[in-house]
Interface confidence: medium
């Protein structure tokens, strides 16, 4: 039985050209995390494997940095980075848990006047 829950930063915003940390946390389970995948709507960003470390997708090598922890740092943001991001936790023995984050990348002037989304 899967008892765990994924806590995420939820809906977040960041400024164009800046960076953002995508973070998920698995709680309420004693299952062992074997791997975490970070995905955008239709592609893989990175993998963190408990034994082998990090794999950054070649398309994102210049803009994605591992961590902190199991999180992911997205750099040099563009408006095209706006959208859904998913953290997929592979665990044993529970199976797979998925968390969702929505990122809105704002033009600098908009961001200066306050983001529409706040980290809960």
């Amino acid at each position: 039985m899967m008892t765990g829950t994924i806590e995420t930063t939820g809906n977040i915003s960041a400024e164009k050209g800046g960076s953002i940390i995508l973070q998920c946390h698995l709680s309420s389970t004693t299952a062992q995390v074997t791997q975490v995948n970070w995905e955008q709507q239709d592609q893989l960003l990175a993998i963190c494997n408990a034994d082998l470390g990090w794999h950054i997708s070649p398309s994102f090598k210049d803009r994605v940095a591992p961590g902190p922890g199991l999180g992911l740092t997205l750099q040099s943001l563009t408006v095209n980075d706006t959208g859904e991001y998913f953290c997929i936790y592979h665990t044993y023995p529970d199976g797979t848990y998925t968390g969702r984050i929505f990122l809105e990348v704002l033009e600098s002037s908009v961001a200066e006047h306050g983001a529409r989304f706040q980290i809960p």
Partner: antibody
Framework: QLQLQESGPGLVKPSETLSLTCTVS??????????WGWIRQPPGKGLEWIGY???????YYNPSLKSRVTIAVDTSKNQFSLKLSSVTAADTAVYYC??????????WGQGNLVTVSS | EIVLTQSPGTLSLSPGERATLSCRAS???????LAWYQQKPGQAPRLLIY???SRATGIPDRFSGSGSGTDFTLTISRLEPEDFAVYYC????????FGQGTKLEIK
């Protein structure tokens, strides 16, 4: 345990397109655990990685073959495919499909010998 | 592109002996990104070692991997008749490359 099986023609004419399909059993091709890749081996020679696809559709190809390669996934059939265009005799090889953890290839098909000849 | 050079090209040994196969990279490779495979005639390669030193599922403990940086080694402590085959190292940097292979033959 994953099992992979290649299928497709064993003979392709020069300048035509080589097409192969890999059927995955014992697991879902939609698993975020794996990449699905193609590797080839010319007769009597070593191994060359062609490319891979992630279940969400993102691909990555060997730069030396990139202009001629297309890898696609069909989740409804639990299959992925390889197309290599404008083939020459140098593309004659055993073509393997394999699953990859992103670091290494853990499960392999038995291989499909494709000969390019008129 | 990282080039992997395996040596020797051919290794002739007898069953019961110890085999040491070398794989040298043209630039430093993370240990996580180095694997070894065994291939017998007419068969697909089989994963032996990943992460430079971790044995894959079902691989006997006579197979061991070691090394870091640019120099990696596959050791077969006591050769069995079924171990005579071709061995390849493979790395993942920004793309996958394989060594040219070492043929392990019966002396």
């Amino acid at each position: 345990q994953l099992q992979l099986q290649e299928s497709g023609p064993g003979l392709v004419k020069p300048s035509e397109t080589l097409s192969l399909t890999c059927t995955v059993s014992g697991g879902s091709i939609s698993s975020s655990r794996y990449f699905w890749g193609w590797i080839r081996q010319p007769p009597g020679k070593g191994l060359e990685w062609i490319g891979y696809i992630y279940y969400r559709g993102s691909t990555y190809y060997n730069p030396s073959l990139k202009s001629r390669v297309t890898i696609a996934v069909d989740t409804s059939k639990n299959q992925f495919s390889l197309k290599l265009s404008s083939v020459t005799a140098a593309d004659t090889a055993v073509y393997y499909c394999a699953s990859s953890s992103a670091w290494y290839f853990d499960y392999w098909g038995q291989g499909n010998l494709v000969t390019v000849s008129s | 592109e990282i080039v992997l050079t395996q040596s020797p090209g051919t290794l002739s040994l007898s069953p019961g002996e110890r085999a040491t196969l070398s794989c040298r990279a043209s630039q430093s490779v993370s240990s996580s990104y180095l694997a070894w495979y065994q291939q017998k005639p007419g068969q697909a390669p089989r994963l032996l070692i990943y992460g430079a030193s971790s044995r894959a599922t079902g691989i006997p403990d006579r197979f061991s991997g070691s090394g870091s940086g640019t120099d990696f080694t596959l050791t077969i402590s006591r050769l069995e008749p079924e171990d005579f085959a071709v061995y390849y190292c493979q790395q993942y940097g920004s793309l996958y490359t394989f060594g040219q292979g070492t043929k392990l033959e019966i002396k």
